[in-house]
Protein backbone atom coordinates (compact mmCIF):
# COMPACT_ATOMS: atom_id res chain seq x y z
CA UNK A 1 0.00 0.00 0.00
CA UNK A 2 1.14 3.23 -0.72
CA UNK A 3 1.96 6.11 1.53
CA UNK A 4 -0.37 8.33 0.45
CA UNK A 5 -3.25 5.58 0.67
CA UNK A 6 -5.55 6.02 3.82
CA UNK A 7 -4.66 3.73 6.78
CA UNK A 8 -7.39 1.14 6.73
CA UNK A 9 -7.17 0.35 10.72
CA UNK A 10 -6.97 2.53 13.49
CA UNK A 11 -5.91 1.94 17.03
CA UNK A 12 -8.79 0.89 19.52
CA UNK A 13 -9.01 4.14 22.06
CA UNK A 14 -11.84 2.93 23.63
CA UNK A 15 -10.03 1.11 27.34
CA UNK A 16 -12.38 -1.51 27.63
CA UNK A 17 -12.03 -2.72 24.29
CA UNK A 18 -8.12 -2.82 24.70
CA UNK A 19 -6.34 -6.00 25.40
CA UNK A 20 -8.46 -8.20 24.13
CA UNK A 21 -6.96 -9.73 21.05
CA UNK A 22 -6.96 -7.21 18.45
CA UNK A 23 -6.30 -3.77 18.58
CA UNK A 24 -6.98 -2.19 15.84
CA UNK A 25 -10.51 -1.39 14.52
CA UNK A 26 -12.25 0.59 11.66
CA UNK A 27 -15.18 3.08 11.69
CA UNK A 28 -18.21 3.04 11.07
CA UNK A 29 -18.81 0.31 12.76
CA UNK A 30 -21.74 -2.59 12.62
CA UNK A 31 -24.41 -0.74 14.03
CA UNK A 32 -23.78 2.58 12.18
CA UNK A 33 -21.30 4.36 14.30
CA UNK A 34 -18.59 7.15 12.92
CA UNK A 35 -17.04 7.69 15.92
CA UNK A 36 -15.39 5.83 18.50
CA UNK A 37 -16.80 8.54 21.40
CA UNK A 38 -20.35 7.77 20.12
CA UNK A 39 -19.62 3.98 20.08
CA UNK A 40 -18.17 4.25 24.06
CA UNK A 41 -21.61 5.75 24.54
CA UNK A 42 -23.53 2.85 23.94
CA UNK A 43 -20.93 0.37 25.32
CA UNK A 44 -21.45 2.57 28.71
CA UNK A 45 -25.49 1.21 28.50
CA UNK A 46 -24.28 -2.11 28.96
CA UNK A 47 -21.92 -1.89 32.15
CA UNK A 48 -23.91 -2.70 34.53
CA UNK A 49 -24.81 -6.28 32.37
CA UNK A 50 -20.95 -6.88 31.94
CA UNK A 51 -20.31 -6.07 35.99
CA UNK A 52 -22.99 -8.49 36.57
CA UNK A 53 -21.16 -11.58 35.14
CA UNK A 54 -24.03 -13.16 32.50
CA UNK A 55 -21.53 -14.05 30.34
CA UNK A 56 -17.51 -14.43 30.21
CA UNK A 57 -18.06 -13.59 26.11
CA UNK A 58 -20.23 -10.29 26.93
CA UNK A 59 -17.74 -7.59 26.73
CA UNK A 60 -15.76 -9.70 23.55
CA UNK A 61 -19.12 -9.37 22.10
CA UNK A 62 -19.90 -5.89 22.27
CA UNK A 63 -16.52 -4.50 21.31
CA UNK A 64 -16.74 -7.12 18.38
CA UNK A 65 -19.92 -5.15 17.51
CA UNK A 66 -18.80 -1.50 18.24
CA UNK A 67 -15.09 -1.71 17.59
CA UNK A 68 -15.25 -4.64 15.11
CA UNK A 69 -11.51 -6.00 13.92
CA UNK A 70 -9.72 -4.55 11.08
CA UNK A 71 -6.93 -6.39 8.92
CA UNK A 72 -5.17 -4.21 6.32
CA UNK A 73 -5.87 -8.19 4.23
CA UNK A 74 -9.59 -6.99 3.85
CA UNK A 75 -11.51 -4.38 3.63
CA UNK A 76 -14.56 -5.09 5.72
CA UNK A 77 -14.63 -5.05 9.15
CA UNK A 78 -14.85 -8.43 11.56
CA UNK A 79 -17.73 -8.62 14.08
CA UNK A 80 -19.17 -11.44 15.65
CA UNK A 81 -20.29 -15.06 14.68
CA UNK A 82 -23.78 -15.67 15.26
CA UNK A 83 -23.08 -18.46 17.74
CA UNK A 84 -21.05 -15.80 19.99
CA UNK A 85 -24.24 -13.67 20.09
CA UNK A 86 -26.41 -16.37 20.54
CA UNK A 87 -24.57 -18.25 23.31
CA UNK A 88 -24.14 -14.25 25.08
CA UNK A 89 -28.16 -13.94 24.54
CA UNK A 90 -29.18 -17.15 26.01
CA UNK A 91 -27.45 -16.36 29.16
CA UNK A 92 -27.76 -12.06 29.07
CA UNK A 93 -31.16 -11.92 28.06
CA UNK A 94 -33.16 -13.10 30.83
CA UNK A 95 -30.98 -10.71 33.04
CA UNK A 96 -32.05 -7.71 30.95
CA UNK A 97 -36.00 -9.16 31.27
CA UNK A 98 -35.20 -9.27 35.00
CA UNK A 99 -34.92 -5.77 34.71
CA UNK A 100 -37.84 -5.62 32.74
CA UNK A 101 -35.77 -4.87 29.81
CA UNK A 102 -36.21 -6.28 26.20
CA UNK A 103 -32.89 -7.88 24.43
CA UNK A 104 -31.63 -4.59 22.03
CA UNK A 105 -32.51 -4.93 18.35
CA UNK A 106 -28.99 -3.73 17.17
CA UNK A 107 -27.42 -6.76 18.56
CA UNK A 108 -30.02 -8.82 16.56
CA UNK A 109 -27.88 -12.27 16.50
CA UNK A 110 -29.36 -12.79 13.00
CA UNK A 111 -27.22 -9.92 11.70
CA UNK A 112 -24.40 -12.14 11.98
CA UNK A 113 -22.40 -14.71 9.88
CA UNK A 114 -23.30 -17.95 11.56
CA UNK A 115 -20.43 -19.08 11.64
CA UNK A 116 -16.58 -17.83 10.61
CA UNK A 117 -15.73 -18.80 6.77
CA UNK A 118 -13.69 -17.69 3.64
CA UNK A 119 -17.42 -15.66 2.53
CA UNK A 120 -18.47 -14.46 5.79
CA UNK A 121 -15.22 -14.11 8.25
CA UNK A 122 -15.98 -13.48 12.00
CA UNK A 123 -14.73 -13.99 15.50
CA UNK A 124 -16.01 -17.13 17.37
CA UNK A 125 -14.54 -15.16 20.70
CA UNK A 126 -13.40 -16.75 23.61
CA UNK A 127 -14.92 -20.06 24.98
CA UNK A 128 -18.28 -19.66 27.11
CA UNK A 129 -17.99 -21.45 30.36
CA UNK A 130 -20.71 -23.58 30.66
CA UNK A 131 -21.83 -23.11 34.52
CA UNK A 132 -25.07 -21.41 36.28
CA UNK A 133 -24.99 -17.97 36.58
CA UNK A 134 -23.56 -16.96 38.98
CA UNK A 135 -25.28 -15.82 42.04
CA UNK A 136 -24.63 -12.14 42.23
CA UNK A 137 -26.88 -9.60 43.06
CA UNK A 138 -28.00 -7.74 40.12
CA UNK A 139 -26.87 -4.32 39.69
CA UNK A 140 -30.65 -3.04 39.57
CA UNK A 141 -32.62 0.06 40.82
CA UNK A 142 -32.90 -0.15 44.73
CA UNK A 143 -29.77 -2.38 45.38
CA UNK A 144 -26.03 -2.06 45.88
CA UNK B 1 -33.86 2.26 47.03
CA UNK B 2 -32.21 4.23 44.43
CA UNK B 3 -31.29 8.09 45.36
CA UNK B 4 -29.53 10.85 43.76
CA UNK B 5 -29.39 13.86 45.85
CA UNK B 6 -27.91 16.85 44.43
CA UNK B 7 -25.98 20.00 46.16
CA UNK B 8 -23.75 23.07 46.01
CA UNK B 9 -26.13 24.94 44.15
CA UNK B 10 -26.58 28.72 44.93
CA UNK B 11 -25.69 32.70 43.65
CA UNK B 12 -22.76 33.25 42.17
CA UNK B 13 -21.41 36.09 40.14
CA UNK B 14 -20.29 36.45 36.59
CA UNK B 15 -16.60 34.82 36.11
CA UNK B 16 -17.08 32.83 39.80
CA UNK B 17 -16.80 28.70 40.38
CA UNK B 18 -19.29 26.34 41.63
CA UNK B 19 -18.55 22.88 42.80
CA UNK B 20 -22.28 20.82 42.50
CA UNK B 21 -22.37 17.58 44.27
CA UNK B 22 -24.14 14.43 43.24
CA UNK B 23 -24.52 11.67 46.09
CA UNK B 24 -25.76 8.31 45.13
CA UNK B 25 -27.04 5.54 47.11
CA UNK B 26 -28.85 2.36 46.45
CA UNK B 27 -26.29 1.41 43.52
CA UNK B 28 -22.66 1.68 42.35
CA UNK B 29 -22.08 4.64 39.91
CA UNK B 30 -18.37 2.14 39.15
CA UNK B 31 -21.02 0.65 36.81
CA UNK B 32 -23.32 3.52 35.42
CA UNK B 33 -22.16 6.54 33.82
CA UNK B 34 -23.25 9.93 35.82
CA UNK B 35 -24.34 12.81 33.28
CA UNK B 36 -25.40 16.12 34.30
CA UNK B 37 -28.19 17.67 32.71
CA UNK B 38 -29.41 21.12 32.70
CA UNK B 39 -32.58 23.59 32.63
CA UNK B 40 -32.40 26.74 32.58
CA UNK B 41 -35.58 28.77 34.15
CA UNK B 42 -38.56 28.09 31.64
CA UNK B 43 -36.53 26.06 28.91
CA UNK B 44 -36.03 22.82 28.08
CA UNK B 45 -33.38 20.22 29.17
CA UNK B 46 -29.65 20.52 27.94
CA UNK B 47 -26.93 17.63 28.57
CA UNK B 48 -23.95 19.58 29.92
CA UNK B 49 -21.57 16.16 30.81
CA UNK B 50 -21.06 12.63 31.06
CA UNK B 51 -18.58 10.16 33.64
CA UNK B 52 -18.30 6.67 32.72
CA UNK B 53 -15.71 5.44 35.58
CA UNK B 54 -15.55 2.72 34.46
CA UNK B 55 -13.85 3.83 31.29
CA UNK B 56 -12.20 6.28 32.49
CA UNK B 57 -14.00 8.96 29.97
CA UNK B 58 -15.42 11.91 29.96
CA UNK B 59 -17.39 14.04 27.83
CA UNK B 60 -18.85 17.46 27.33
CA UNK B 61 -21.03 20.03 25.69
CA UNK B 62 -19.37 22.38 23.66
CA UNK B 63 -21.20 25.19 25.64
CA UNK B 64 -19.05 23.89 28.73
CA UNK B 65 -16.03 22.66 27.52
CA UNK B 66 -13.03 23.96 29.19
CA UNK B 67 -14.71 25.70 31.64
CA UNK B 68 -17.16 22.89 33.31
CA UNK B 69 -15.30 19.33 34.78
CA UNK B 70 -17.08 16.67 35.68
CA UNK B 71 -15.69 13.74 38.35
CA UNK B 72 -16.57 11.01 40.49
CA UNK B 73 -15.16 9.91 43.96
CA UNK B 74 -16.29 6.48 43.56
CA UNK B 75 -15.48 5.53 47.23
CA UNK B 76 -17.62 8.27 48.12
CA UNK B 77 -20.47 7.06 45.37
CA UNK B 78 -20.23 10.76 44.49
CA UNK B 79 -20.15 12.28 41.42
CA UNK B 80 -19.25 16.05 40.80
CA UNK B 81 -19.37 18.82 38.11
CA UNK B 82 -16.96 21.54 38.80
CA UNK B 83 -18.24 25.07 37.27
CA UNK B 84 -15.62 27.50 36.44
CA UNK B 85 -15.46 31.11 34.65
CA UNK B 86 -19.40 30.80 35.24
CA UNK B 87 -22.03 33.21 33.22
CA UNK B 88 -25.10 34.57 33.13
CA UNK B 89 -26.68 31.97 30.90
CA UNK B 90 -25.07 28.87 33.46
CA UNK B 91 -28.21 30.29 35.14
CA UNK B 92 -30.07 27.13 35.25
CA UNK B 93 -31.05 24.19 37.60
CA UNK B 94 -28.61 21.27 37.33
CA UNK B 95 -30.10 17.57 37.72
CA UNK B 96 -27.76 14.41 37.92
CA UNK B 97 -28.71 11.44 36.43
CA UNK B 98 -27.86 7.56 35.93
CA UNK B 99 -27.43 6.52 32.41
CA UNK B 100 -27.38 3.14 31.69
CA UNK B 101 -29.42 0.99 29.09
CA UNK B 102 -33.09 2.23 29.17
CA UNK B 103 -31.60 6.03 29.32
CA UNK B 104 -31.62 8.15 32.29
CA UNK B 105 -33.59 6.13 34.33
CA UNK B 106 -33.13 7.71 37.61
CA UNK B 107 -32.71 11.82 38.21
CA UNK B 108 -31.83 14.17 41.47
CA UNK B 109 -34.29 16.86 42.21
CA UNK B 110 -32.67 19.56 41.07
CA UNK B 111 -29.88 22.04 42.34
CA UNK B 112 -30.27 25.76 41.50
CA UNK B 113 -27.44 27.49 40.29
CA UNK B 114 -27.79 31.50 39.57
CA UNK B 115 -25.15 33.48 38.04
CA UNK B 116 -25.91 37.47 38.54
CA UNK B 117 -23.90 40.35 40.08
CA UNK C 1 -24.76 17.83 16.61
CA UNK C 2 -28.01 15.58 15.90
CA UNK C 3 -30.70 17.79 16.35
CA UNK C 4 -34.31 16.25 17.62
CA UNK C 5 -37.16 18.76 16.20
CA UNK C 6 -40.10 18.44 18.21
CA UNK C 7 -43.73 18.89 17.21
CA UNK C 8 -45.79 20.43 18.46
CA UNK C 9 -44.64 23.06 20.76
CA UNK C 10 -47.62 22.78 23.08
CA UNK C 11 -51.47 21.16 22.54
CA UNK C 12 -54.33 21.42 24.49
CA UNK C 13 -56.53 18.31 25.12
CA UNK C 14 -59.12 16.58 27.28
CA UNK C 15 -59.35 13.64 29.43
CA UNK C 16 -59.54 10.86 27.29
CA UNK C 17 -57.96 11.90 24.13
CA UNK C 18 -55.34 10.70 22.47
CA UNK C 19 -52.15 12.70 22.03
CA UNK C 20 -49.67 12.43 19.93
CA UNK C 21 -46.06 13.78 19.60
CA UNK C 22 -43.42 13.25 17.09
CA UNK C 23 -39.61 14.04 16.94
CA UNK C 24 -38.21 14.08 14.23
CA UNK C 25 -33.71 13.40 14.38
CA UNK C 26 -31.24 15.63 11.81
CA UNK C 27 -29.65 12.29 11.36
CA UNK C 28 -29.79 8.52 11.98
CA UNK C 29 -29.74 7.49 15.90
CA UNK C 30 -30.89 4.05 15.44
CA UNK C 31 -33.25 2.92 18.03
CA UNK C 32 -31.41 5.14 20.39
CA UNK C 33 -34.42 7.60 21.46
CA UNK C 34 -35.91 7.97 25.23
CA UNK C 35 -39.02 9.61 26.10
CA UNK C 36 -39.61 11.36 29.38
CA UNK C 37 -42.31 13.46 31.13
CA UNK C 38 -41.43 16.24 33.26
CA UNK C 39 -44.01 18.37 35.66
CA UNK C 40 -43.39 21.76 37.14
CA UNK C 41 -40.70 21.74 39.44
CA UNK C 42 -39.86 18.22 39.34
CA UNK C 43 -37.12 15.68 37.66
CA UNK C 44 -38.23 14.61 34.65
CA UNK C 45 -39.05 10.88 34.30
CA UNK C 46 -38.05 7.77 31.74
CA UNK C 47 -41.43 6.73 29.91
CA UNK C 48 -40.01 4.63 26.84
CA UNK C 49 -36.45 3.90 26.13
CA UNK C 50 -35.19 2.12 22.47
CA UNK C 51 -37.92 4.22 20.97
CA UNK C 52 -40.83 1.97 21.61
CA UNK C 53 -39.82 0.30 24.82
CA UNK C 54 -42.10 0.68 27.52
CA UNK C 55 -39.92 1.53 30.81
CA UNK C 56 -40.91 -0.23 34.05
CA UNK C 57 -44.04 0.79 36.23
CA UNK C 58 -45.20 2.90 33.19
CA UNK C 59 -48.82 2.96 32.13
CA UNK C 60 -49.79 1.11 29.06
CA UNK C 61 -51.61 3.71 27.49
CA UNK C 62 -48.26 5.12 26.53
CA UNK C 63 -46.33 3.74 23.51
CA UNK C 64 -43.68 4.99 21.21
CA UNK C 65 -42.55 3.77 17.70
CA UNK C 66 -40.22 4.71 15.26
CA UNK C 67 -39.97 4.88 11.22
CA UNK C 68 -36.54 6.00 9.98
CA UNK C 69 -35.77 9.34 11.62
CA UNK C 70 -38.96 10.05 12.89
CA UNK C 71 -39.93 8.92 16.32
CA UNK C 72 -43.53 9.56 17.91
CA UNK C 73 -44.67 9.26 21.41
CA UNK C 74 -48.47 8.08 21.76
CA UNK C 75 -50.32 8.49 24.45
CA UNK C 76 -53.43 6.46 23.70
CA UNK C 77 -56.40 8.31 26.66
CA UNK C 78 -55.15 10.97 28.47
CA UNK C 79 -55.51 11.01 31.56
CA UNK C 80 -55.32 13.92 34.36
CA UNK C 81 -51.50 13.13 35.75
CA UNK C 82 -50.70 13.36 32.39
CA UNK C 83 -50.71 16.78 31.59
CA UNK C 84 -46.86 17.90 31.32
CA UNK C 85 -43.97 18.38 29.40
CA UNK C 86 -42.44 15.50 27.21
CA UNK C 87 -39.13 15.75 26.09
CA UNK C 88 -37.18 13.15 23.19
CA UNK C 89 -33.79 12.86 23.88
CA UNK C 90 -31.21 11.10 21.46
CA UNK C 91 -28.11 9.01 23.43
CA UNK C 92 -26.53 7.81 19.84
CA UNK C 93 -23.41 9.90 19.95
CA UNK C 94 -22.40 13.03 21.99
CA UNK C 95 -23.77 15.69 22.72
CA UNK C 96 -26.43 13.59 23.84
CA UNK C 97 -29.61 16.34 22.35
CA UNK C 98 -33.05 16.52 23.92
CA UNK C 99 -36.07 18.16 22.08
CA UNK C 100 -37.80 21.39 22.87
CA UNK C 101 -40.44 19.82 24.59
CA UNK C 102 -44.18 19.15 24.23
CA UNK C 103 -46.25 21.08 26.79
CA UNK C 104 -49.76 18.95 26.67
CA UNK C 105 -52.51 21.27 28.29
CA UNK C 106 -55.84 20.96 29.39
CA UNK C 107 -58.29 22.23 27.12
Known amino acids: FGDEEERRCDPIRISMCQNLGYNVTKMPNLVGHELQTDAELQLTTFTPLIQYGCSSQLQFFLCSVYVPMCTEKINIPIGPCGGMCLSVKRRCEPVLKEFGFAWPESLNCSKFPPQNDHNHMCMEGPGDEEVPLPHKTPIQPGEE | EVQLVESGGGLVQPGGSLRLSCAAS????????MHWVRQAPGKGLEWVASISSYYSSTSYADSVKGRFTISADTSKNTAYLQMNSLRAEDTAVYYCARFWYPGMDYWGQGTLVTVSS | DIQMTQSPSSLSASVGDRVTITCRAS??????VAWYQQKPGKAPKLLIY???SLYSGVPSRFSGSRSGTDFTLTISSLQPEDFATYYC?????????FGQGTKVEIK
Open chain 3, 50 to 52: SAS
Open chain 3, 89 to 97: QQHWSYPIT
Open chain 2, 26 to 33: GFNISYYS
Open chain 3, 27 to 32: QSVSSA
